[in-house]
Every structure is written in structure tokens, then in C-alpha cells.
């Protein structure tokens, strides 16, 4: 769809005569008829296949034609077409004399024709005017013409319809060839897809307008590249949404159970060594001179019983002092003024003279010790029992009474409570110091995962020891968030705190 435009510029008829040579009376009142048609090698009369247009009387004899787009588009003359422009044309321009006001062909005498010109050729669509001048023996016509596309039509032959738009079916303007030119921030075949914020994750983010990054469920962050962990996840992270992968030292569904109390809380004082011994539990190994659960108490120097031979110890600001019994002297009452004659050896110990009778030494029978065989041998002083085992003196020997979960002469072997697969329904077994713990799959609970969880998992108050119950809506199971000092799927196991 387009328009053939013809701009009349000047018509010269100096003698004011008709084509027949007869003069016009009083002068030639001139108007034009234009016929536009398909290309003909020899332009002949016949239908004006591309259109016709007529002008009013524009002047008398010789005159210039003013540009006039306001008065109904008289100059240039408009010949619209609603087909593909073929690139070739034939044009006939007739100048007529109007004796009266009626310009209809049937109202004019045949000899009212002043001049007739016919041209044909190629014409490409474009904004530029082609200037032409046609001369006969008595007249001269100067004019220009062009073909332009109608609004919203583009291309070499005005055949491509394109309407700029800025809605969700496209955000574009039209190029001269009719192709789309996307507005900034838009892409796609029809410029319908916004260009998201640079770096916005391809799968996890999207946008409905340019430079935006909206996150799909389970993702967050400016670029939607950070997963959202499980609701309530305390000390954990995720690699996919709704996960809760615990940081080192933390456990439980919400990673809120402290498995590394030593690092997180540093409970041991005075340079003691801390050892994790379970959820929220630990053991402090004190340096010499300190005692207490957290080695927070400084030992009295007399607590180590430094005074020998029955000497009594007295604490002093700068240490201690031994008050020796009769017959003994020295810093620790270690020297005796007695001899074998004084029968200093107790419990059947035999006395041997030393240094020509100035001193003596007692040889003690089994189970007794001390410089005077005054002490019963305690075979447990070296703390031989591991893992909290209790040492028992049994005459000349000793034995270790082990805590649950340990065995061996010195309680050095850990009994695996999980060896017999005690957890039902695919539960995961965890060895604890004093037993085991089952982590149950979704839909099961109980100490051994033997209970199938009901729909309202928390309705039956399954958590012990004032634990908080959470219902996992996706699996219809409960999760117990244990208070300090308890573990287990229902927080039913007390942790042996030191």
C-alpha cells in the first residue's frame, strides 16, 4: 500500500491556444487530469489501472503551481494504491480548458484539450522527487513525482505491513525494510522477551520487564543464584532449595544441635583441654593445679598430700608447709630421726639399717607401700580405665567397671549398639556414648522408628523433655527440637553431662 505523488510546478502556454491551435476566449482556464496505469511500452488509452485524479482550475495560460497540501491535498496530487508497487508505471497528464465551472468530462467539448503528455518507465519507492519537463510545439509542463509507502507499510514495494508497538506482543519500531527493531531492553523474534538484569540466573530467575530479576520458588538474591534453605535451618546451608546441610559441628534436621560445643563455646578454663563427647556435652582435662567441671577451680597445694610420714600440711600464700610428727624432718617430712631399733616399719615391713645405723629403709610386704609401709597400695591411682570406666581395687590386682557402650580390660573398646541394625523402616543408627539414636525417615518415629506417624504428627505430643515439635507438612512427619541435655528423635535420651 502506497501513494504515487505528482507535483505540478509550472505550465507554459504563452499564446493561450488549444491543441487544435484555436485560441481560448478570453484565455485558457487550465486544469489537469492525471491517469496512472501499469507499464505499457507504448502508452495507449484505456483503464487507469492504478488510479486517476483531477485538479480544479489552477491558472490561465502560463502559470506556476503553488504547493498546497492543505486544500484537500491538491498539490502534490495523490494517487493511492493498495497493492504491491510493481516498480514500473505509465503516466498520462492532460491539460484542459474549462469554459465554465463544470469540469466533468461529459460537460466539456472534445476540442477543449490543451495538451497531453504520456511517459512510462521504472520507478523505485523512495523519498526523492524525480523532476521532468515535457514540451510540445505550443506548451511546456514542468513537474516532479515519486512513490512513497503508506503509513505502516515498508520495503522496496510497500508490501510489508509493520506497526510499531509497545505492549506484551512486542516492543519495537519498524526499520525501513519492514523488519522489527527492538526497543532497548527487549529481545526475541517479536521483541517480546525482556532482557533480564545482567547475570540473572537462566533457570532460577526470570523477568517481565528489562533489567529485572525475579526469583523462582526456592531461590533468592539479586541474581536468584542463592538457594533458600529449609525453614528454621540455623547453622546450615543448601545447594538446592529447602535443603539444610549442617555446618561443621552442628547436627539435627535444622542444624541447631551443637556437636562441637568446645569450639563454639570454649567452656574449659585455665588452659584445660576440651573434648566433645556428644550433643552439647564435653569433657575438660585440667592442667595440674586445677579442678572442676570446667577446670575453673584452683587446687590447694595441700590437696596433693605432699607431706610424708604422717606430716600435716598447712596452706600458705606462697605455697605450703609440712608439720612433721616426732622423729621426722625435711621439707616433706621425708627424713627420719628413727632407727630400726624404734620398729618404724608397719604392716609387717622389715627394717634395714642404712648409713651405719643413722638411717633405715622399710621393705614392705605386697599391697603396702610408703617409707614406713603405712599405706595400702592403690592400684587405681594411675587411672588406667578409659572412657570413664571405674577402677576397683581387688586385693593384689585391680579391675575396670565399664560404662555402658564400652568393654575390654581397660574399657578401651567401644561396643557398637548399631551392629544389630536396631532402627526400623530404614532409620539411620547413630552410636552415642551411652546408647544409640535412630534418625527416622519421613513418616516414622519412635526410639527405633517403629511408629508410623499420623497426619497431624505433633497432635500426639511425641516429643519428650519439653522439646518443641514441628510438623513437616511435605511428609506428614514431626521433628523434635531438643532442649539442652537431650537427644533422640523424640529427645528421649538424656546426654550424660559432666
Amino acid at each position: 500500500s502506497g501513494v504515487f505523488q505528482l507535483q505540478l510546478q509550472e505550465f507554459i502556454n504563452e499564446r493561450g491556444v488549444l491543441a487544435s491551435g484555436r485560441p481560448c476566449e478570453p484565455g485558457c482556464r487550465t486544469f489537469f487530469r492525471v491517469c496512472l496505469k501499469h507499464f505499457q511500452a507504448v502508452v495507449s488509452p484505456g483503464p487507469c489501472t492504478f488510479g486517476t485524479v483531477s485538479t480544479p482550475v489552477l491558472g490561465t495560460n502560463s502559470f506556476a503551481v503553488r504547493d498546497d497540501s492543505s486544500g484537500g491535498g491538491r498539490n502534490p496530487l495523490q494517487l493511492p494504491f493498495n497493492f504491491t508497487w510493481p516498480g514500473t508505471f505509465s503516466l498520462i497528464i492532460e491539460a484542459w480548458h474549462a469554459p465554465g465551472d463544470d469540469l466533468r468530462p461529459e460537460a466539456l467539448p472534445p476540442d477543449a484539450l490543451i495538451s497531453k503528455i504520456a511517459i512510462q518507465g521504472s520507478l523505485a519507492v523512495g523519498q526523492n522527487w524525480l523532476l521532468d519537463e515535457q514540451t510540445s510545439t505550443l506548451t511546456r509542463l514542468r513537474y516532479s513525482y515519486r512513490v512513497i509507502c503508506s503509513d505502516n507499510y515498508y520495503g522496496d514495494n510497500c508490501s510489508r505491513l509493520c506497526k510499531k508497538r509497545n505492549d506484551h506482543f512486542g516492543h519495537y519500531v519498524c526499520q525501513p525494510d519492514g523488519n522489527l527493531s527492538c526497543l532497548p531492553g527487549w529481545t526475541g523474534e517479536y521483541c517480546q522477551q525482556p532482557i533480564c538484569l545482567s547475570g540473572c540466573h537462566e533457570q532460577n530467575g526470570y523477568c517481565s520487564k528489562p533489567a529485572e530479576c525475579l526469583c523462582r520458588p526456592g531461590w533468592q538474591g539479586r541474581l536468584c543464584n542463592e538457594c533458600i534453605p529449609h525453614n528454621g535451618c540455623r547453622h546450615g546451608t543448601c545447594s538446592t532449595p529447602w535443603q539444610c546441610t549442617c555446618d561443621e559441628g552442628w547436627g539435627g534436621l535444622f542444624c541447631d544441635q551443637d556437636l562441637n560445643y568446645c569450639t563454639h563455646h570454649s567452656p574449659c578454663k585455665n588452659g584445660a583441654t576440651c573434648s566433645n563427647s556428644g550433643q552439647r556435652s564435653y569433657t575438660c582435662t585440667c592442667r595440674p593445679g586445677y579442678t572442676g567441671v570446667d577446670c575453673e577451680l584452683e587446687l590447694s597445694e595441700c590437696d596433693s598430700n605432699p607431706c610424708r610420714n604422717g606430716g600435716s600440711c598447712k596452706d600458705q600464700e606462697d605455697g605450703y608447709h609440712c608439720l612433721c610428727p616426732p622423729g621426722y624432718y625435711g621439707l616433706h617430712c621425708e627424713h627420719s630421726t628413727l632407727s630400726c631399733a624404734d620398729s618404724p616399719c608397719f604392716n609387717g615391713g622389715s627394717c634395714r639399717e642404712r648409713n651405719q645405723g643413722a638411717n633405715y629403709a622399710c621393705e614392705c610386704p605386697p599391697n603396702f607401700t610408703g617409707s614406713n609401709c603405712e599405706k595400702k597400695v592403690d592400684r587405681c591411682t594411675s587411672n588406667p580405665c578409659a572412657n570413664g570406666g571405674q577402677c576397683l581395687n581387688r586385693g593384689p590386682s585391680r579391675m575396670c567397671r565399664c560404662r555402658p557402650g564400652f568393654t575390654g580390660t581397660y574399657c578401651e573398646l567401644h561396643v557398637s549398639d548399631c551392629a544389630r541394625n536396631p532402627c526400623a523402616h530404614g532409620g539411620t543408627c547413630h552410636d552415642l556414648e551411652n546408647g544409640l539414636m535412630c534418625t527416622c525417615p519421613a513418616g516414622f518415629s519412635g526410639r527405633r522408628c517403629e511408629v508410623r506417624t499420623s497426619i497431624d504428627a505433633c497432635a500426639s505430643s511425641p516429643c519428650f523433655n519439653r522439646a518443641t515439635c514441628y510438623t513437616d507438612l511435605s511428609t506428614d512427619t514431626f521433628v523434635c527440637n531438643c532442649p539442652y541435655g537431650f537427644v533422640g528423635s523424640r529427645c528421649e535420651f538424656p546426654v550424660g553431662l559432666p
Epitope: 506484551h168 506482543f169 523474534e189 517480546q192 522477551q193
Partner: antibody, heavy 121, light 107 residues
């Protein structure tokens, strides 16, 4: 051959929420060439555009209905869903789902058979 | 709100004669117009899109034009199966707008 089929309740009470599902068969709802829309037609009256959605989740609504309407897409089920709250007897109509083609300037080249919804107590 | 006004409301044309339906809206020529045919008891069917294009399967007796404030649907030679209500439609920003419909009958 792409076909669309509406499903949902035939009767809803005033103030209730209407949920209609359009199931697309024979083609993917995730195509970048189409928007998926809802249009309604009260008995004996003309067509009224309700809104549409792109496979990415971008939505557009008729301003006169925007406060009551939500359209969502489930690409895994090849479905899109119309939710209209606070239904009123004037919402009684045949509800159509349709495919709006970008290549056709937004023209709806495929329509469902329509589902009649009556709002009455 | 953008309004599309169709005229006439109804039209009775003899078989084989031309039927012309008009759709008016402000600067409608700057938008793409679509036309839908809806037969009784059926869903609407697209017959013209982007002013003058026909989807496959639509007879060439259906034609459309759009310029200025008016879009026109023309059925060059009315057939019995063309009896229906015809709706024009255009997009105003991001909102779909339908005309009120024109009922075409046989005279």
C-alpha cells in the same frame, strides 16, 4: 493439532472463588510464540478479555478485573489456571481459554470449547 | 478506557452479495485489528489477523482493511455458512479490547 480444554465448577456461590483450569494438548505451553489467555462471554452478550500469561509467568490483566483475577501457569502439567475471587451473579458467563499468537499480532488462533459458570446462591 | 465500536449491530444481506462490517476506535489504524466469527453455540474463530491476513482454511471471500480510525471486514459474496456474529478486536497497550459484535444474517 493443538487443542485447549477448560475444566472447573459449573456453579459457584456469590463471594466464593472460581478456579478454572485450561489443559493444552498437542503442543507445549512453554513455547515462546504464544500467550495463553482467558476470555468470557455473558449470556447473549459480547466477548470480554480477562487476561493472559506467558510461559515465564509474566501476566497481564484487564484493568476492570485486575483486583480479583490471578492467572498462573504449570508448565509441567501443560496447564494454565484462572482464579477469580469474590464472584458475583454478574460474573455468570461462558469462560473460554485461548492461545494468542505473537506471529498474528496477538490474535487468538485456538480456542477451548468454553465452560459455562453460573454464580448463584 | 479504549473502546471499539462496531456498526451496524446487525446486517441482513442476500446470498452472494457483499457484506461490510465497520469497527471504529481512536487511531485504530496504528494498531493491528483482528476479526472473529462466532456461530451459535460455538467458540469464536479467527478469520482475519493483522488487519488483512487470513489464517489457513479461511476462504478468500473474507478480507480486511484498517486505516485512520476504522477497520473493515468484508465478505465479498455471502454464503449460508457465514451467518454468525462477528467481533473486531485490538490491543490497547497490554489490554485486549473487543467490539460489541455485528450479527450477519441472510436477507
Amino acid at each position: 493439532e493443538v487443542t485447549l480444554r477448560e475444566s472447573g465448577p459449573a456453579l459457584v456461590k456469590p463471594t466464593q472463588t472460581l478456579t478454572l483450569t485450561c489443559t493444552v494438548s498437542g503442543g507445549s505451553i512453554s513455547s515462546s510464540s504464544y500467550y495463553w489467555g482467558w476470555i468470557r462471554q455473558p449470556p447473549g452478550k459480547g466477548l470480554e478479555w480477562i487476561g493472559d500469561i506467558y510461559y515465564t509467568g509474566s501476566t497481564y490483566y484487564n484493568p476492570s478485573l485486575k483486583s480479583r483475577v490471578t492467572i498462573s501457569v504449570d508448565t509441567s502439567k501443560n496447564q494454565f489456571v484462572l482464579t477469580m475471587t469474590n464472584m458475583d451473579p454478574v460474573d455468570t458467563a461462558t469462560y473460554y481459554c485461548a492461545r494468542q499468537a505473537l506471529a498474528m499480532g496477538g490474535g487468538s488462533d485456538k480456542w477451548g470449547q468454553g465452560t459455562t459458570v453460573t454464580v448463584s446462591s | 478506557d479504549y473502546v471499539l465500536t462496531q456498526s451496524p449491530d446487525s446486517l441482513a444481506v442476500s446470498l452472494g452479495e457483499r457484506a461490510t462490517i465497520n469497527c471504529s476506535g481512536q487511531r485504530l489504524g496504528d494498531k493491528y485489528a483482528s476479526w472473529y466469527q462466532q456461530k451459535p453455540g460455538q467458540s469464536p474463530k479467527l478469520v482475519i489477523y493483522e488487519d488483512s491476513k487470513r489464517p489457513s482454511g479461511i476462504p478468500d471471500r473474507f478480507s480486511g482493511s484498517n486505516s485512520g480510525d476504522d477497520a473493515t471486514l468484508t465478505i465479498s459474496s455471502l454464503q449460508a455458512e457465514d451467518v454468525a456474529v462477528y467481533y473486531c478486536q485490538a490491543w490497547d497497550r497490554d489490554t485486549g479490547v473487543f467490539g460489541g459484535g455485528t450479527k450477519v444474517e441472510i436477507k
